[in-house]
């Protein structure tokens, strides 16, 4: 398990809400990440492929989320204090192999400004 | 250690129909899309259908798209496979299989199929 | 559909020498840095054995004897040094999309 700091700016801010980015590589074909609050999963997401190449995306615990091809953004709106945490991208590779996980992470700051407006984006 | 059992095969007439089951053990059975592959007397494989983590997507091959449906039940780790309207050229060993992210990597032992009057 | 074709039908080869199998799809089966290509191994009244995926990495378990090679649409099979237990008949097959298909395999016997 490979634990750090993210490297990107891993925090958005958008009218009340938060966009968080967990960043994958490129490479990466089969996988799951989930976010983390501390150490309680709020989200997850995770993208497989079947014989066929289909590609199936499933979420146990489900937050709006968006895939990229190299990222998976995952969004909380109405903030408040309470946010305010550590949050980290759980990633577990299943493709290709060989499986690996890492966690990646960051502190969410939470100011006044940031509350001002609860518009979903 | 991943095991597949199959079970339900048999001799039926043409026309008529089978249910296939395939027990899979070792594993988390909900993590992984799994597979039917079948094989004719003396010949090659043959892949039949496949069915994802959840069951919610499922692909057929050309010849038996129509007639098969692939089916599973998480909570019992347990693949299905109902073959309707079957033909002579539907006789052959049929093997579960789970596709391990880039291949079948899991094999149960397969059961017969015969379908013949 | 890709169709996939294999050669030879059947080889023999002498134990300890080298056996080739080649396999070749009617379309390509690279995407981005992948070749969605595999090898499977299926000895008499056995169920098949995945050897190799994506063309070239050998599944955990198999010995090195066994090597993938290839791209695009031609690819082959490589027992490096050939044993008793490598009898069996060898399929490859793609997931490029669906439907996935197998060769029709390829019979390798001790001479």
């Known amino acids: 398990e490979i634990n750090g700091s993210a490297n990107y700016e891993m925090f958005i801010f958008h009218n009340g809400g938060v966009q968080i980015l967990c960043k994958y590589p490129d490479i990466v074909q089969q996988f799951k990440m989930q976010l983390l609050k501390g150490g309680q999963i709020l989200c997850d997401l995770t993208k497989t492929k079947g014989s066929g190449n289909t590609v199936s995306i499933k979420s146990l615990k489900f937050c709006h989320s968006q895939l990229s091809n190299n990222s998976v953004s995952f969004f909380l709106y109405n903030l408040d204090h309470s946010h305010a945490n550590y949050y980290f991208c759980n990633l577990s590779i299943f493709d290709p192999p060989p499986f690996k996980v890492t966690l990646t992470g960051g502190y969410l700051h939470i100011y006044e400004s940031q509350l001002c407006c609860q518009l979903k984006f | 250690e991943v095991q597949l059992v199959e079970s339900g095969g048999g001799l039926v007439q043409p026309g008529g129909s089978l249910r296939l089951s395939c027990a899979a053990s070792g594993f988390t059975f909900s993590d992984y899309w799994m597979d039917w592959v079948r094989q004719a007397p003396g010949k090659g494989l043959v892949w039949v259908s496949n069915i994802d983590e959840d069951g919610s997507i499922t692909e057929y091959s050309p010849f038996v798209k129509g007639r098969f449906t692939i089916s599973r039940d998480n909570a019992k780790n347990t693949l299905y496979l109902q073959m309707n309207s079957l033909r002579a050229e539907d006789t052959a060993v049929y093997y579960c299989?789970?596709?391990?992210?880039?291949?079948?990597?899991?094999w149960g032992q397969g059961t017969l199929v015969t379908v013949s009057s | 559909d890709i169709v996939m074709t294999q050669s030879p039908d059947s080889l023999a080869v002498s134990l300890g020498e080298r056996a080739t199998i080649n396999c070749k799809s009617s379309q390509s089966l690279l995407s981005g840095s992948f070749n969605y290509l595999t090898w499977y191994q299926q000895k008499p009244g056995q169920p098949p054995k995945l050897l190799i995926f994506y063309a070239s990495t050998r599944q955990t378990g198999v010995p090195d004897r066994f090597s993938g090679s290839g791209s695009g649409t031609d690819f082959t099979l490589t027992i490096s040094s050939l044993q008793a237990e490598d009898v069996a008949v060898y399929y490859c097959h793609h997931h490029y999309n669906a439907p996935p298909t197998f060769g029709p395999g390829t019979k390798v016997d001790i001479k």
């Open positions: 299989t789970r596709w391990g992210r880039f291949g079948f990597d899991s």
